[in-house]
Interface confidence: medium
């Protein structure tokens, strides 16, 4: 169990900086992750909506705080997920 | 140049149902959060719904929540908003409008009558 | 009954400056960005404003905008005749889990 977490969140915070990338090939991940971030209202990876760097302008509402149940916090003047994802992705590994 | 068109507007009696189609170019249309946005003859902008770029989450008022349903389908580039159980109330001219928490383009709207 | 409050009518001679004002709750100006459309007659609306101050490229510096607490206003300068519209403020509102408008106020010139 372990040995699995630490391999899943090494993955998670590896990949992190494919959000921030501007590649074509990079795109089909941060897409993903965007469906991600819809379904369970969370934001990023590892630090929320710095992850995203120069691509948080790029993607509109990208994690827009819309749901008035979850916590929100400010980013570059927009209100954002507070969560970050990781934990998520982690349990929807676990699970599935 | 980003372009929003709608179609699917018309006079239909009430109780019946209609389907609103909004078709977008000129941007991504998958990156993009989509609204509708209404106007009674006369009145002020009244917002309807909104869906996040992958239909993962999705707004109604409630003043049409439970009889309309908005839908995407990002292979089209196309925005669709259907309406059943339609009221007298729901007579206005409807909107689709590019992203949810600021609508920055708009198209030039659809006429849906509800009438007997 | 509009869950922000703007005033129903405002009115300016040419080369005057108007303010139009709307006022929220905590729910939506307080804690949202606010934006501001313009609405020419029998026209779509217009993004004028957003992100409570910015303006969108094309929209004259004439057209300014504020926010403080749960209060916003529009400020026009040196008014124009083409300047007559109807305007609305608009922000996302946290408690409804929906997007509000104001009433809009209509602009004589």
């Known amino acids: 169990k372990s040995k699995s977490d630490r391999i899943v969140n090494e993955t998670l915070y590896e990949n992190t900086k494919l959000l921030s990338a501007t590649g074509e090939s990079e795109k089909q991940f941060q897409e993903a992750i965007i469906v991600f971030q819809e379904e369970f209202k969370c934001c990023g990876l590892v630090n929320g909506a710095a992850d995203w760097g120069n691509n948080f302008q790029h993607y509109p509402e990208l994690c827009a705080c819309l749901d008035k149940q979850r916590p929100c916090q400010s980013y570059n003047g927009k209100q954002v997920y507070k969560e970050t994802c990781i934990s998520f992705i982690k349990d929807f590994l676990a699970k599935n | 140049e980003v372009q929003l068109l709608e179609s699917g507007g018309g006079l239909v009696q009430p109780g019946g149902s209609l389907r609103l189609s909004c078709a977008a170019s000129?941007?991504?249309?998958?990156?993009?959060?989509m609204s509708w946005v209404r106007q009674a003859p006369g009145k002020g902008l009244e917002w309807v719904s909104g869906?996040?770029?992958?239909?993962?989450?999705?707004y109604y008022a409630d003043s049409v929540k439970g009889r309309f349903t908005i839908s995407r389908d990002n292979s089209k580039n196309t925005l669709y908003l259907q309406m059943n159980s339609l009221r007298a109330e729901d007579t206005a001219v409807y909107y689709c409008?590019?992203?949810?928490?600021?609508?920055?383009?708009w198209g030039q709207g659809t006429l849906v009558t509800v009438s007997s | 009954q509009s869950v922000l409050t703007q005033p129903p009518s405002a009115s300016g001679t040419p080369g005057q400056r108007v303010t139009i004002s709307c006022t929220g709750s905590?729910?939506?100006?307080?804690?949202?960005?606010v934006s501001w459309y313009q609405q020419l007659p029998g026209t779509a609306p217009k993004l004028l404003i957003y992100?409570?101050?910015h303006r969108p490229s094309g929209v004259p510096d004439r057209f300014s905008g504020s926010k403080s607490g749960t209060s916003a206003s529009l400020a026009i300068s040196g008014l124009r005749s083409e300047d007559e519209a109807d305007y609305y403020c608009?922000?996302?509102?946290?408690?409804?889990?929906?997007?509000?408008f104001g009433g809009g106020t209509k602009l004589t010139v």
């Open positions: 409008a590019r992203r949810s928490t600021i609508f920055d383009y």
């Open positions: 000129g941007f991504t249309f998958s990156n993009y959060a």
């Open positions: 869906i996040s770029p992958n239909s993962g989450n999705k």
């Open positions: 905590s729910s939506n100006i307080g804690s949202n960005d």
């Open positions: 992100d409570n101050s």
């Open positions: 608009g922000a996302w509102d946290a408690s409804l889990s929906g997007y509000v």
